[in-house]
Each structure stands twice: as structure tokens, then as C-alpha cells.
């Protein structure tokens, strides 16, 4: 596919600023024009680009889901930063949703880590000190915990 093969029909907002690409790339906060001669500004609060690029389109800003709080808004060069609400967390293997933190540890275990926006409470066996992993069995005795204080943001894109 040659670059010249692209023939766009672009309804660019009048306020979108244009500048010239550097070696075929546009700076963060911009995308490249159809003919490759211009860099077109992303739309603030709507889309963004984070790196030098030759993208036809800026990327859409993430919108925080219910159950999330917005730590920082989307700019033309940075996506929205969302974080799970207090008492919930996001796991690496299921990043699309926030899950409720457990309120306590299973019987025979003690809590060694608080609930944070990116991790559930951490439980270890009283005697061995080994961590508990996997689903929690029915909680017979629990050690209650209060949600942890956020220490760093959890950023999602797309």
C-alpha cells in the first residue's frame, strides 16, 4: 500500500491546529494528514496520541466506568487515568472491571496487606506465612480490614 493511495475526506474542526511532520512523523497530541504534509491536532478531551506517530487518527479517550474515579482527565497527549473506587481493585488478568475487595481472611490466615485499587487484601497462613491464592472458601472467621489508601494510579487505555 503506497502512501499516495490514501485519499481522505476529512471534516476537521476549524480550531484543529496544523504543523509540519518531522521525518514523516507527527508529535504527541497530533495525527498525520492524508497527504502526509501536515500534523493535525487531536481534539482535547476527545482523543489523544502519546508518541511521535504517523497515525491516521488520534486514539479515543478512555471514559471511566461506574465504580471508577478519574484521577486525571484526558488531554491531547495523555489518556484519562481511571482508578477503582475505594474498597475495590482491578486485577491484571481482568483489567476491564473493578472487583470488591474481601472483607477478611479465611480461617487460619492473617491479613498482611490492605485492599488497594490494584490488589485485594493479602492473606497468609498463620503458621507457615505462605500467601493465600485463588478463590476464598466460605469465610468462617474473618479478620476485618478497612480499604487501603491509594498509593499510585492504575491507568487504562482504549
Amino acid at each position: 500500500i503506497t502512501q499516495q493511495d490514501l485519499a481522505p475526506q476529512q471534516r476537521a474542526a476549524p480550531q484543529q491546529k496544523r504543523s509540519s511532520p518531522s521525518e514523516g512523523l507527527c508529535p504527541p497530541g497530533h495525527h498525520i494528514s492524508e497527504d502526509g504534509r501536515d500534523c493535525i491536532s487531536c481534539k482535547y478531551g476527545q482523543d489523544y496520541s502519546t508518541h511521535w506517530n504517523d497515525l491516521l487518527f488520534c486514539l479515543r479517550c478512555t471514559r471511566c466506568d461506574s465504580g471508577e474515579v478519574e484521577l486525571s482527565p484526558c488531554t491531547t497527549t495523555r489518556n484519562t487515568v481511571c482508578q477503582c473506587e475505594e474498597g475495590t481493585f482491578r486485577e491484571e488478568d481482568s483489567p476491564e472491571m473493578c472487583r470488591k475487595c474481601r472483607t477478611g481472611c479465611p480461617r487460619g490466615m492473617v491479613k498482611v496487606g490492605d485492599c488497594t485499587p490494584w490488589s485485594d487484601i493479602e492473606c497468609v497462613h498463620k503458621e507457615s506465612g505462605t500467601k493465600h491464592s485463588g478463590e476464598v472458601p466460605a469465610v468462617e472467621e474473618t479478620v476485618t480490614s478497612s480499604p487501603g489508601t491509594p498509593a499510585s494510579p492504575c491507568s487504562l487505555s482504549g
Epitope: D47, F57, L59
Partner: nanobody, 124 residues
């Protein structure tokens, strides 16, 4: 995970029209840019057209400019390609793709998903 399913292909005479659809399921594609590619028999994949997530910026390959129109309905999670004034050289399997964006030349950027394709045959 996004699944894309193309439909609307078929056999048509030169000068005729067809409308291809690409239905997305599994997850909304309203956050994604979308595009159509095609592969003619014995040829490589060719970029046809692309549309940004908001549907307000479109790109067309020179070979289809003025004849093809790309559009999307985010409420229906569907991408369309209206093809008119069809020519024999438009004969190909047409694929839709969703990606965070597309680079100049058509290469997908970021997460991307592809359909299985629908065959368009243009012959007298």
C-alpha cells in the same frame, strides 16, 4: 474480545452496487477506528478505507475514491461499505478490521481485530 462478522458480499455486474456490513459482537467497537481491506485472488492485502472512532474522518484508497463510502453506526456496533460503479478489479474478499488507530498505508495500530471476510465478485 471483539468478534467481527462481514456480510453483504455476492456476485454483481460491472457498474452495479453492493453494501457490505460488518457486525461487531463481544464488546463495543465505538472506541476503535475501523477499516475495510480487500484481497484479490493471487494478490496481497490492500487497504480500502478507514474511519475514525467518531465517524468524522474518513480515508479512501485512490482506487476506490468517489465510488465507495465507509460509514458506521456505533449504536448498532456496525461498519458499512457502500460500493457503487463496481469494476472487475474490485473482485476480492473484503475484510473489516477494528483497531485503536491505523497508520498511513493502513497498518493497524494497537489492539486490533479482524473478520473472516466476505467475497465480492464483479463479472458480466
Amino acid at each position: 474480545e471483539v468478534q467481527l462478522l462481514e456480510s453483504g458480499g455476492g456476485e454483481v455486474q460491472p457498474g452495479g452496487s453492493l453494501r457490505l456490513s460488518c457486525a461487531a459482537s463481544g464488546r463495543t467497537v465505538s472506541n476503535y477506528a475501523m477499516s475495510w481491506f480487500r484481497q484479490a485472488p493471487g494478490k496481497g492485502l490492500e487497504f480500502v478505507s478507514a474511519l475514525n472512532w467518531g465517524g468524522d474522518t474518513t480515508y479512501y484508497a485512490e482506487s476506490v475514491k468517489g465510488r465507495f463510502t465507509i460509514s458506521r453506526d456505533n449504536a448498532k456496533n456496525t461498519l458499512y461499505l457502500q460500493m457503487s460503479s463496481l469494476r472487475a478489479e474490485d473482485t476480492a474478499v473484503y475484510y473489516c478490521a477494528a483497531a485503536q488507530s491505523f497508520r498511513r498505508g493502513g497498518a493497524p495500530y494497537g489492539d486490533n481485530y479482524w473478520g473472516q471476510g466476505t467475497l465480492v465478485t464483479v463479472k458480466p
